[in-house]
């Protein structure tokens, strides 16, 4: 029998590596069983996470799972950093891994790293 | 049921490159990360790297930097890993393990191939 | 990178007596979510490593309660109470905590 609590599945140490001026949608897969969760983004600020208060963010309901999404109209340059998604459910906090956006600004592009170069340069990819 | 399958045994020669697959049955590979860990004859394990299906964003130890490229195709629900400039350090049985939702904890693992480079 | 020593490298141990392997890494792998992704996996003769205990010491489905994991910060123990013929092999501890990924050297275990 499946678990009826709530879970966030982002995963861990996950990174996503994208560009200034683009649109991006920042997922947060959200499983639950009867009511959907009341759902929230924040951005990590050392050891605190600030909550994104007025940002666009929309559901997308597929058959398995939902998906509370985090919308970038556009990306900008100090979009870059952590970020994690909690539930309100019966009255518990349920936090998701966090999740990295590497944004390369758009006056760079032309000197835009690959996923590999990202790969191979760690004072990019370990901040 | 959950599983792994990888490719058969390669027998290559130095200089040489090499596409190793692997492709999952019972679970989506976007739903996971799948790292690739290599085991030379002498029992020792090291990490290659791993890739995130669903983004593509890839992660290597830098020891397989410009060695190792992984890549993954979420159609065909397979992982491969390309080796390139082959030598005889190369020789190996490389696994595929895949976390389920990203856990890092290496929940499944498949047979292995092996990898012989000989001239 | 995070430096994984595994002792001892062959432990000879007689059915119904107990075992530990000792590993010991070189930077705390308490992670920044409060779990510790110290893991122990088993390779039996002529097959894959299997998981057998992560995040310090959650039993693997279907491992025997015979085998705990225990541990903090840079210094881990598996323990098996009582050896049986199936636990031969070689056991690896890894941690996961910090890129790059890193194994212990392994330690094989023998009846005697």
């Known amino acids: 029998k499946e678990s009826c609590d709530v879970q966030l599945y982002i995963k861990r140490q996950s990174e996503h590596s994208i560009l200034a001026g683009d649109p991006f949608e920042l997922e947060c897969p959200v499983k639950y069983c009867a009511n959907r969760p009341h759902v929230t983004w924040c951005k990590l600020n050392g050891t605190t996470c600030v909550k994104l208060e007025d940002r666009q963010t929309s559901w997308k309901e597929e058959k398995n799972i939902s998906f509370f999404i985090l919308h970038f109209e556009p990306v900008l340059p100090n979009d870059n950093g952590s970020y994690r998604c909690s539930a309100n459910f019966q009255s518990n906090l349920i936090e998701s891994h966090s999740t990295t956006l590497y944004v390369t600004d758009v006056k760079s592009a032309s000197e835009r790293p690959s996923k590999d170069e990202m790969a191979s340069r760690p004072w990019l990819l370990y901040r | 049921e959950v599983q792994l399958q990888q490719s058969g045994a390669e027998l290559v020669k130095p200089g040489a490159s090499v596409n190793l697959s692997c492709t999952a049955s019972g679970f989506a590979i976007r739903d996971t990360y799948l790292h690739w860990v290599k085991q030379r004859p002498e029992q020792v394990l090291e990490w290659t790297g791993r890739?995130?299906?669903?983004?593509?964003?890839?992660k290597y130890d830098p020891r397989f930097q410009g060695k190792a490229t992984l890549t993954a195709d979420t159609s065909s629900n397979t992982a491969y890993l390309h080796l390139s400039s082959l030598t005889s350090e190369d020789t190996a049985v490389y696994y595929c393990?895949?976390?389920?939702?990203?856990?890092?904890?290496?929940?499944?693992w498949g047979q292995g191939t092996t990898l012989t480079v000989s001239s | 990178d995070v430096v994984m020593t595994q002792t001892p490298l062959t432990l000879s141990v007689t059915i119904g007596q107990p075992a530990s392997i000792s590993c010991k890494s070189s930077q705390s792998l308490l992670d920044s979510d409060g779990k510790t992704y110290l893991n122990w996996l088993l390779q039996r003769p002529g097959q894959s490593p299997k998981r057998l205990i992560y995040?310090?010491?959650k039993l693997e489905s279907g491992v025997p309660d015979r085998f705990t994991g225990v541990g903090s910060g840079t210094d881990f123990t598996l323990k098996i109470s009582r050896v049986e013929a199936v636990d031969l092999g070689v056991y690896y501890c890894?941690?996961?905590?910090?890129?790059?990924?890193?194994f212990g050297g392994g330690t094989k275990l023998e009846i005697k």
């Open positions: 995040v310090l010491s």
């Open positions: 890894w941690q996961g905590t910090h890129f790059p990924y890193t």
């Open positions: 890739i995130d299906p669903a983004n593509g964003n890839t």
């Open positions: 393990v895949a976390d389920y939702y990203g856990s890092s904890l290496f929940d499944y």
